[in-house]
C-alpha cells in the first residue's frame, strides 16, 4: 500500500536487523513523469539493489559489526538517465542481534592491593569487549566474581563493578586482609553480555592473580611527652609513613587549639615544636594525612594521641587569703571546727598534688599555744585541749602549712569563738493560711513571706535562720531563700505548679541554725509553721515529652517506612491529635492518633538533611489547645547520583591546526556524601569510536585530563562522551559530554566573523 | 549491428509539412531514446528533442514546440519527426541519434546516428 | 538554455602538431551530486554524421585514440589532440546534456595546413 512500502522519493530510514537472510522488499518508490527509471549510490556493499522500477531490496544478510549504517542515495533519471529528482539519502540502520560473545583483553591478568585499602577503591581493572552493540544488551557487559581462592570463613574480600569490571576490596577484605596471613589470591572473573540477565546471553572468563603487600600506612602508639621540657625544640616524637614514596605529609588540628605545638615534615617524622604544659591541656589528638601530588587525601587520617606527663611544678594554694571558721564555746574537745581545703594545679591522685596540711603558729596563745590541731591529710581543723572562753579571746589566728613533694605554702584561719547556740528559732506564726494560685504562676514568683527570731548572738551561725519545706512538696516545687539581715523567708515557686497532679498542699517549713544546738536544747514545735496551698486549675496545652526529636534513617527507605515517633501528654487527660507542620517536601505524614510518622515519598540527602517539620499537639475537645515541637529527621547517604560535570565546560577549544597534540582539565563532582577523603571518581572515553582521537587519564578522584592524540582534526566542535565511575555501592556512572571546538585563532582567541558571535568558545588550550 | 537508417530528401513548399522518419535495428527499440538534431549548411548543431518510445515520453526544445512533433512506431521500430508550416528557415539538415544511456549503461552520449536528411523549403 | 561558446572557430595546424580548442558553458556543468560533468566531445568530419570523443568531459570512448583528451570541469572545457594527423581533419562540437534543452557550441574547425 502507499506510505508504509511504497512511496514518492524522499529522504528515508530504515531499520533491518543484521543475520536475517531477506524476506520483504525495502521499500517500492513511485516515479513522477518524466523520470522513468531510479539509481542507487553510496555504501551499497553490493548488497542493497534497487529495480528500474523503484524497487529497493536487499540480496544477503547484513551484519552490524561490519557497517552498522548504510548510507544510501537514491536518484530518479529520465530515459536520458540524467536526474530529475534527488538524489535523496536513504539510510539503512543495522538494527543488532547478539551474535558476537564478549572477550576479555587477557587470559590473565595481574594486581596488588595492600591491605586495609579503602573499600571500593579500584585496584586492577577487567576488561572485556563485544563487537555487538553496546547501546542494546547485546553488547551491555556484565562482569561478576566466580570463585575467589582461598575462601576464608565463606567471606568475600574482593567485589567487582558489574559494569566497568573494576576489582576492589569489600568491607571485610578492607580490614581482614593480612599478607602475613594469605599474601595471595584468585579470582575467576567472568562477562556476560545482555547485562548478565539472559539465560541466552554469552560468556568469557578470566583469571585474576592478586598479591597482598602490607600497609605501613598505620596509627602509630599513643606517645607521653614529659611537660616543660627543657631539651631542644623541635623534639621527635613519632613518625607516620606512608606506602610509596612522594606523599606529602600534614597535621590536622581537629580541636582548633589556637596554639598548636606539632608539626610532620615531608619524611612523616612528627615533632612537638615547644615545651608542653600539662596544666593548660593534659592530652592531645590530632591527625596524620598523607596526600598525592594534587593534594588529594591517599587514605583515611591516622590518629595521634599525645598524653603530657606531670611533673611537680606547682605549689598548693589556699582557697582564700583568710579562711574563717565559728567554734561555740562550750564546744567538746575533738569537735570539728571546719575543713581546711586547699588545692593543687598538679595532676590529681599524683605524689605531685598529694597535700600535708601542719599547724606553724597560733595567735594568741592564750589560755595556751596547742588549743587546735589539723588533719594531716584531709584538713579538718578540731578543738584540741579545752573549751574557749568568748571573753578571754574572742578570736584565734593560725597559721598552716599546706605542702606537696616540692613545695610550702602558708594559709591563714581566722576562728571566731561565739556565744552557745542555746536558743532555737522561733516563728512568729505557726500557720500561715490558705494562699490560692492558678497553676500557671510564673517561676521566680515571691508568693508567701515568713519570719521566725533567734535571741542568740546576732551574725552568727547560732542566730542564722535556715528554712526548709520539710512537707508537702516532694516535687520541690517550691523553694525558700532567706535575708542574712533579717532573717526573712521569701516563698518562691521554683517549678511550675500543677493542678493535675497537686491541687492542694499542706506545706510545713521548719527554721533552723547552721551551728548546732548545745546540748540538751532541741528543735521544738516553735520551729515550725505550716501552710496550705491551693491551685486553681488553668486549661494547659499538651506537652511534649522532648523539645526536640530526632531520627536518623537511609535515604533510600522504602515508601511507607516508619521513620520515627513523637509523644505527647496533655495535663488534663484529653486524647491528643498529632499533625505534621512544615512538610515541604511532601515527604512525611503523622498517624494522628500514635504519634507515628512514615515516609509517603522518596527521600533525598542531597535535598538537604537534617529534614526539619514540625509536629504539633492538640487537644482533642476541651478548648483544643496544641503545642509544637520540632521533628529533626537526619538521612544517611546512599550512592544514588551518578557523577557529573563540576561546572559548564562549553566554550574550550583548540586553535586550528593543532601544531601539537593538546589537552584540557576537567573536574567532576557528585551530589552524594563524601567524608574526609572526598570522592574517588575513574574516568574513561563513553565510547570506543573516540579511541582513535581522544585519550582521558585521571589526575585525582576529581579531575583528568583529556588529550587530542594527534592534530589531524577538523575545523568544527567535537563532542567528546566521557564516562565518569564513582566506584560507590553501588556504583554510579554518568556519561557527560565534553564540547570542543577546533577553530582558527586570533591572538589567541577563537575567530567568528561578523554575524557569528553566537556560542563564541572562551578557554583555548 | 546498430543502424539508424533515415529517409531520403525532400524538397517542400512553404506552409507545408513534411515527415521524416529513422528506421532502427540492431537493438530493442524501446530501450533507448531517440534524438533528433538540426544541421544547417556550414552551421553547428541544434538539439530539437527526443522520444523515449518504451513510454512515449517526448521532450521538446521550447525553441522547436508547435514546428515539431516526434512520434514512433513500436512494430515497426521507427522514429519519426514531422515539421509543419515550413519556411525557408527550416531548410536544414535533420539527423537523428540514438542515446547511449539505457537502465544499468553509462553510457552517456550520442553513439549512433542516423545519416541525415535534407529538407529544402523552396517556393 | 544554457550556452555552449567554442574557440577558436577554426584553426589550422600541420600534422603532428598539439592542437587545444575550448568550450565554455553559461553556466556550472558539475552535478553536485555525482561530481561529474555533464558534457561530450564530438568530431563531425566532411559529409558524415558526428561521432563521439569524450563523455563526462574527460572520459574517452572506447576506440578513440589516445591522442584525443578532454578536460576541465564546472565552466571551462578543453579538447587537447596531443600529436594530429591528417585523418582529424573535422569540425569538433562539445555539447551539455546537464539541462534541457541540451546544446552544442558553434564548432572548431580543425584544417590541416
Known amino acids: 500500500q502507499e506510505g508504509k512500502f511504497s512511496g514518492p522519493l524522499k529522504p528515508m530510514t530504515f531499520s533491518i536487523y543484521e543475520g536475517q537472510e531477506p524476506s520483504q522488499i525495502i521499500f517500492q518508490f513511485k516515479a513522477n513523469p518524466p523520470a522513468v527509471t531510479f539509481e542507487l549510490t553510496g555504501e551499497t556493499d553490493n548488497i542493497f539493489v534497487i529495480e528500474r522500477e523503484g524497487l529497493l531490496y536487499y540480496n544477503r544478510a547484513l551484519d552490524r559489526e561490519t557497517r552498522s549504517t548504510h548510507n544510501l542515495q537514491v536518484a530518479a533519471l529520465d530515459a536520458n538517465g540524467i536526474i530529475v529528482e534527488g538524489p535523496v539519502p536513504i539510510t539503512i540502520k543495522v538494527k543488532d542481534i547478539n551474535d558476537n560473545r564478549p572477550t576479555f583483553l587477557q587470559s590473565k591478568y595481574e594486581g596488588s592491593v595492600r591491605q586495609n585499602s579503602r573499600p571500593g577503591k579500584p585496584f586492577l581493572y577487567v576488561n572485556a569487549t563485544d563487537l555487538d552493540d553496546p547501546a542494546t544488551p547485546n553488547g551491555q557487559l556484565y562482569y561478576q566474581i566466580v570463585i575467589q581462592l582461598p575462601m576464608i570463613n565463606n567471606v568475600m574480600y574482593f567485589q567487582i563493578n558489574n559494569k566497568t569490571g573494576a576489582i576492589s576490596l569489600t568491607r571485610e577484605g578492607s580490614q581482614e586482609l593480612n599478607p602475613a596471613k594469605n599474601p595471595s589470591y584468585n579470582l575467576v572473573i567472568s562477562v556476560k553480555d545482555m547485562g548478565g540477565q539472559s539465560e541466552n546471553s554469552f560468556s568469557d572468563t578470566t583469571s585474576v592473580d592478586i598479591i597482598v603487600t602490607e600497609n605501613i600506612w598505620k596509627a602509630p602508639k599513643p606517645v607521653e611527652m614529659v611537660e616543660n621540657s627543657t631539651d631542644p625544640h623541635p623534639i621527635k616524637i613519632t613518625q607516620v609513613r606512608w606506602n610509596d614514596p612522594g606523599a606529602q605529609y600534614s597535621l590536622v588540628d581537629k580541636e582548633k587549639l589556637p596554639r598548636f605545638p606539632f608539626s610532620i615534615d615531608q619524611e612523616g617524622d612528627i615533632y612537638v615544636t615547644q615545651p608542653l604544659d600539662r596544666e593548660e591541656k593534659d592530652a592531645y589528638v590530632f591527625y596524620a594525612v598523607a596526600k598525592d601530588e594534587y593534594g588529594k587525601p591517599l587514605s583515611y587520617p591516622l590518629e595521634i594521641h599525645v598524653k603530657v606527663k606531670d611533673i611537680n611544678d606547682n605549689p598548693p594554694t589556699c582557697p582564700s587569703p583568710v579562711t574563717v571558721f565559728e567554734v561555740q564555746e562550750n564546744e567538746r574537745l575533738g569537735n570539728s571546727i571546719g575543713t581546711l581545703t586547699a588545692h593543687d594545679r598538679d595532676e590529681e591522685n599524683t605524689a605531685n598534688s598529694f597535700l600535708n596540711y601542719r599547724i606553724v603558729e597560733q595567735t594568741p596563745k592564750l589560755p595556751m599555744d596547742g588549743l587546735f590541731l589539723i588533719q594531716t591529710y584531709a584538713g579538718m581543723l578540731q578543738l584540741a585541749k579545752q573549751s574557749l572562753k568568748k571573753q578571754d579571746t574572742p578570736q584565734y589566728n593560725l597559721t598552716i602549712e599546706v605542702s606537696d613533694k616540692d613545695f610550702k605554702t602558708l594559709c591563714f584561719v581566722q576562728i571566731n569563738v561565739i556565744d552557745i547556740n542555746d536558743q532555737i528559732p522561733i516563728f512568729e506564726k505557726s500557720d500561715y493560711g490558705n494562699l490560692t494560685l492558678a497553676e500557671d504562676t510564673n517561676i521566680g514568683s515571691t508568693i508567701l513571706t515568713i519570719q521566725a527570731t533567734d535571741a542568740d548572738e546576732p551574725f552568727t551561725g547560732s542566730s542564722k535562720i535556715l528554712y526548709h519545706i520539710i512537707k508537702g512538696d516532694s516535687e520541690g516545687r517550691l523553694g525558700v531563700d532567706t535575708d542574712p539581715h533579717t532573717n526573712t523567708g521569701y516563698v518562691i515557686i521554683k517549678k511550675p505548679l500543677d493542678f493535675e497532679t497537686a491541687a492542694v498542699s499542706n506545706i510545713v517549713f521548719k527554721a533552723e541554725n547552721p551551728e548546732p544546738l548545745v546540748f540538751g536544747v532541741k528543735y521544738n514545735a516553735s520551729s515550725f509553721a505550716k501552710f496550705t496551698l491551693i491551685v486553681t486549675d488553668v486549661n494547659e496545652a499538651p506537652q511534649f515529652s522532648q523539645h526536640v526529636f530526632q531520627a536518623k534513617v537511609s535515604e533510600d527507605v522504602a515508601i511507607g517506612t516508619k521513620v520515627g515517633n513523637v509523644t505527647a501528654k496533655d495535663p488534663e487527660g484529653l486524647d491528643i491529635s498529632y499533625s505534621l507542620r512544615g512538610d515541604t517536601r511532601g515527604w512525611l505524614k503523622i498517624d494522628h492518633v500514635t504519634g507515628e510518622i512514615f515516609s509517603v515519598a522518596p527521600l533525598d540527602r542531597e535535598a538537604g538533611s537534617p529534614y526539619r517539620v514540625q509536629v504539633v499537639a492538640t487537644e482533642v475537645g476541651g478548648s483544643s489547645l496544641s503545642s509544637v515541637s520540632e521533628f529533626h529527621l537526619i538521612l544517611m547517604d546512599v550512592n544514588d547520583n551518578p557523577p557529573r560535570l563540576a561546572k559548564d565546560y562549553t566554550g574550550l577549544f583548540f586553535c586550528h591546526p593543532l601544531s601539537a597534540p593538546g589537552s584540557l582539565i576537567f573536574e567532576a563532582t557528585d551530589d552524594d556524601q563524601h567524608l574526609f577523603r572526598g570522592p574517588h571518581f575513574t574516568f574513561s572515553l563513553g565510547s570506543g569510536s573516540l579511541q582513535n582521537d581522544w585519550e582521558v587519564s585521571k589526575i585525582n578522584g576529581t579531575h583528568a585530563r583529556l588529550s587530542t592524540r594527534h592534530t589531524e582534526f577538523e575545523e568544527r566542535e567535537y563532542v567528546v562522551l566521557i564516562r565518569i565511575n564513582d566506584g560507590g555501592r553501588p556504583p554510579l556512572e554518568g556519561i557527560v559530554s565534553l564540547p570542543v571546538t577546533f577553530c582558527s585563532c586570533v591572538e589567541g582567541s577563537c575567530f567568528r566573523p561578523a554575524g557569528h558571535q553566537t556560542g563564541i568558545p572562551t578557554v583555548g588550550m | 549491428q546498430v543502424q539508424l537508417v533515415q529517409s531520403g530528401a525532400e524538397v517542400k513548399k512553404p506552409g507545408s509539412s513534411v515527415k521524416v522518419s529513422c528506421k532502427v535495428s540492431g537493438y530493442t527499440f524501446t530501450d533507448h531514446t531517440i534524438h533528433w538534431m538540426k544541421q544547417r549548411p556550414g552551421q553547428g548543431l541544434e538539439w530539437i528533442g527526443y522520444?523515449?518510445?518504451?513510454?512515449?515520453?517526448?521532450q521538446y526544445n521550447e525553441k522547436f514546440k508547435g514546428k515539431v512533433t516526434l512520434t514512433a512506431d513500436k512494430s515497426t521500430s521507427t522514429a519519426y519527426m514531422e515539421l509543419s508550416s515550413l519556411r525557408s528557415e527550416d531548410t536544414a539538415v535533420y539527423l537523428c541519434?540514438?542515446?547511449?544511456?539505457?537502465?544499468?549503461?553509462?553510457?552517456?552520449?550520442?553513439?549512433?546516428w542516423g545519416q541525415g536528411t535534407t529538407v529544402t523549403v523552396s517556393s | 538554455d544554457i550556452v555552449m561558446s567554442q574557440s577558436p572557430s577554426s584553426l589550422a595546424v600541420s600534422v603532428g602538431e598539439k592542437v587545444t580548442m575550448s568550450c565554455k558553458s553559461s553556466?556550472?556543468?558539475?552535478?553536485?551530486?555525482?561530481?561529474?560533468?555533464?558534457l561530450a566531445w564530438y568530431q563531425q568530419k566532411p559529409g558524415q554524421s558526428p561521432k563521439v570523443l569524450i563523455y563526462?568531459?574527460?572520459t574517452r570512448e572506447s576506440g578513440v585514440p589516445d591522442r584525443f583528451t578532454g578536460s576541465g570541469s564546472g565552466t571551462d572545457f578543453t579538447l587537447t589532440i596531443t600529436s594530429v594527423k591528417s585523418e582529424d581533419l573535422a569540425v569538433y562540437y562539445c555539447?551539455?546534456?546537464?539541462?534541457?534543452?541540451?546544446?552544442f557550441g558553434g564548432g572548431t574547425r580543425l584544417e590541416i595546413k
Open positions: 555539447q551539455q546534456y546537464y539541462s534541457y534543452p541540451w546544446t
Open positions: 522520444i523515449y518510445p518504451r513510454d512515449v515520453i517526448t
Open positions: 541519434a540514438r542515446w547511449g544511456y539505457f537502465y544499468g549503461s553509462r553510457s552517456y552520449y550520442f553513439d549512433y
Open positions: 553556466q556550472s556543468l558539475l552535478h553536485s551530486s555525482n561530481q561529474k560533468n555533464y
Open positions: 563526462w568531459a574527460s
